[in-house]
């Protein structure tokens, strides 16, 4: 049994390393942006019994700008973009209670002269502007407006070979 | 479709640093996200970091501290500074344009470069 894949959540990203039941990721908040203190950014594949279908439970995140980072200026394209700001710790307690964030909740502060990647501020967040289009066997699975109205779309990347290890179980590529 | 390929592995000594890059070619580069990922012989790929289009990034706790992730879109490029190595760091690395699911969600694509091997060993 296999999560979908998880929820979208305003200015801020998750690269998920594993679909499994059990498995615990974390969103990062945009660069410019910081977790709000008293939400949580991580997440669980969690079994509903009753249905016996697997989810991810509903972070409470929410990624709030960063005053610190408001008055900065757009980096120039050929700026290497890097971060600095080390991430809090987060745990999935049965409380489900977590530290306050009163920094940064991630890596996401980038460097002074890198604080905001050109033309990330002029389009719709998260929009792409190329790629193919991924159509997921999952997009109506949730219902939420973020899965079901957006327009799915992936990158892939081609190469010679592809290395044994594991691959998200039940999500493959369309190419 | 977007091609990669690494380099920047060698052999190093442990404490040692290395800077690995992965370039990449074809359109949507600079959009997507990039994670690293390093496999030794008979065990799993494990995946190490990644950075996201708006420069954000996220580490694994094994290198949490060691290692920063970076990109520079005018070259296409995303690096991987590994700092203050360690014997365990020895594996075959290699970059994932990732594929993009929902608005924001990401994960690895299947496909993959041919990687760069880092041996760290005195």
């Known amino acids: 049994i296999t999560c979908p894949p998880p929820m979208s959540v305003e200015h801020a990203d998750i690269w998920v390393k594993s679909y499994s039941l059990y498995s615990r990721e974390r969103y990062i908040c945009n660069s410019g942006f910081k977790r709000k203190a008293g939400t949580s950014s991580l997440t669980e594949c969690v079994l509903n019994k009753a249905t016996n279908v697997a989810h991810w439970t509903t972070p409470s995140l929410k990624c709030i700008r960063d005053p610190a980072l408001v008055h900065q200026r757009p980096a120039p394209p050929s700026t290497v973009t890097t971060a600095g700001v080390t991430p809090q710790p987060e745990s999935l307690s049965p409380s489900g209670k977590e530290p306050a964030a009163s920094s940064p909740s991630s890596n996401n502060t980038a460097a002074t002269t890198a604080a905001i990647v050109p033309g990330s501020q002029l389009m719709p967040s998260k929009s792409p502007s190329t790629g193919t289009t991924e159509i997921s066997s999952h997009e109506s699975s949730h219902g939420t407006p973020s899965q079901t109205t957006a327009k799915n779309w992936e990158l892939t990347a081609s190469a010679s070979h592809q290395p044994p290890g594991v691959y998200p179980q039940g999500h493959s590529d369309t190419t | 479709e977007v091609q990669l390929v690494e380099s920047g592995g060698g052999l190093v000594q442990p404490g040692g640093s290395l800077r690995l890059s992965c370039v990449g070619s074809?359109?949507?580069?600079?959009?997507?996200?990039v994670g690293w990922y390093r496999q030794t012989p008979g065990k799993q790929r494990e995946w190490v970091a990644v950075?996201?289009?708006?420069?954000?990034?996220d580490y694994a706790g094994s290198v949490k501290g060691r290692f920063t992730i970076s990109r520079d879109n005018a070259k296409n490029t995303v690096y991987l500074q590994m700092n203050s190595l360690k014997p365990e760091d020895t594996a075959v690395y290699y970059c994932?344009?990732?594929?993009?699911?929902?608005?924001?969600?990401?994960?690895?694509?299947?496909?993959w470069g041919q990687g760069t091997q880092v041996t760290v060993s005195s």
């Open positions: 074809g359109d949507g580069f600079s959009i997507s996200a």
């Open positions: 994932n344009a990732g594929v993009t699911t929902n608005p924001g969600v990401h994960r690895a694509s299947r496909h």
């Open positions: 950075i996201f289009a708006s420069g954000s990034t």
